[in-house]
């Protein structure tokens, strides 16, 4: 049941990307939404041999990846703040999962280039806006109202049934001859009508 609700929640989430709103904004699609998560693409020039790439959310370092080479040209790849990441020859992809509204923020790729020299730092970024689909918004809006209405109807129904049951019970307890009296009234009326005709 919990997993069903979770999948429903993931289905409800959608990503909208607004780039070009900040200085040093990415001139490429920085956010790619899939599998209930987001792939944040941080590009670097092909010529860059050794670097550190940090993913910043606002001013906070979320993830980092450092690529260096030793004196034997052996590559070392390290992460101090580990995220699921993927390295290609011109980009680092960081993956964020279990998205919710708190993930909506400015995200920056902070690239420190060690090699080739000179040492250089570049910052590119965009805004990750998380919103819910229309269908979900409608469902989320009407679902509690529907549930509340159902509960109210159930309660009112219960009250009505209880009231009717109570009324019926109370009337039969207070007037045990009620049915007999009604019959007697009917018989009396019949007799009087017959008398009138005879007269």
């Amino acid at each position: 049941m919990k997993s069903g609700l979770w999948y429903f929640f993931l289905f409800c989430l959608r990503i909208k990307v607004l780039t070009g709103e900040i200085n040093g904004s990415a001139n490429y699609e920085m956010f790619i939404f899939h599998n209930g998560g987001v792939q944040i693409l941080c590009k670097y020039p092909d010529i860059v041999q050794q670097f550190k790439m940090q993913l910043l959310k606002g001013g906070q370092i979320l993830c980092d990846l450092t690529k260096t080479k030793g004196s034997g040209n052996t590559v070392s790849i390290k992460s101090l703040k580990f995220c699921h990441s993927q390295l290609s020859n011109n980009s680092v992809s960081f993956f964020l999962y279990n998205l919710d509204h708190s993930h909506a923020n400015y995200y920056f790729c902070n690239l420190s280039i060690f090699d080739p020299p000179p040492f250089k730092v570049t910052l590119t970024g965009g805004y990750l806006h998380i919103y819910e689909s229309q269908l979900c918004c409608q469902l989320k809006f009407w679902l509690p109202i529907g549930c509340a209405a159902f509960v109210v109807v159930c309660i009112l129904g219960c009250i009505l049934i209880c009231w009717l049951t109570k009324k019926k019970y109370s009337s039969s307890v207070h007037d045990p001859n009620g049915e007999y009296m009604f019959m007697r009234a009917v018989n009396t009326a019949k007799k009087s009508r017959l008398t009138d005709v005879t007269l």
Epitope: I47, T66, T68, K69, G70, S71, G72, N73, S76, P117
Partner: antibody, heavy 117, light 111 residues
């Protein structure tokens, strides 16, 4: 200012062992690959071994592979070279060097290791 | 392993004159747009000092009379105007792959 200070050299008999240390200061030690380079008296430079920033990758010259072990302690900013089964041809000044991304940009003054009976 | 050779073994040059040192590798050191070759200077009684990396890029603080050139397997270090403080042994070194190796060195003296 970057400083590398080697210690642990000395006279040792063939087949013996020595452990060299290199104390680093003036930079973030854990950000750099580190190497040992040696120089026999009156001869040229010979690369010995290197180690990556975290100590997970190590490489050795064919001359020392299986006998020497490089290691580091980032908490102590120290590089080590454990030398076993020493031979006369291992006699040299051993330099601790920082691999500065594209060259050995900082060197210690060296420590002399003499292997002799 | 890549073998590095240098020529000449030594040379004597007058002050203010040009000194040229050659270095040859047994295989190409070019990868992408980079030649994985460095030059070091070692003065008597001192550790080596990085002069040139990527075959032609001067290290910070190195005088501009030092220049590097070449690509692939053939490289040159040039001191355009020799100064007294340039008396040293010069080594070329590759970091194309493991193990990195040094050339045998070229000793530069004043004539």
């Amino acid at each position: 200012e970057v400083q590398l200070v080697e210690s642990g050299g000395g006279l040792v008999q063939p087949g013996g062992s020595l452990r060299l240390s290199c104390a680093a200061s003036g930079f973030t030690f854990s950000d750099y690959w580190m190497d040992w380079v040696r120089q026999a008296p009156g001869k040229g430079l010979v690369w010995v071994s290197n180690i990556d920033e975290s100590g997970s990758i190590t490489e050795y010259s064919p001359f020392v592979k299986g006998r020497f072990t490089i290691s580091r302690d980032n908490a102590k900013n120290t590089l080590y070279l454990q030398m076993n089964s020493l031979r006369a041809e291992d006699t040299a000044v051993y330099y601790c060097t920082r691999w500065g991304r594209f060259g050995f940009d900082s060197w210690g003054q060296g420590t002399l290791v003499t292997v002799s009976s | 392993d890549i073998v590095m050779t240098q020529s000449p073994d030594s040379l004597a040059v007058s002050l203010g004159e040009r000194a040229t040192i050659n270095c040859k590798s047994s295989q190409s050191l070019l990868s992408g747009s980079f030649n994985y070759l460095t030059w070091y200077q070692q003065k008597p009684g001192q550790p080596p000092k990085l002069l040139i990396f990527y075959a032609s890029t001067r290290e910070t603080g190195v005088p501009d009379r030092f220049s590097g050139s070449g690509s692939g397997t053939d490289f040159t270090l040039t001191i355009s105007s020799l100064q007294a403080e340039d008396v040293a042994v010069y080594y070329c070194h590759h970091h194309y792959n493991a193990p990195p190796t040094f050339g045998p060195g070229t000793k530069v003296d004043i004539k």
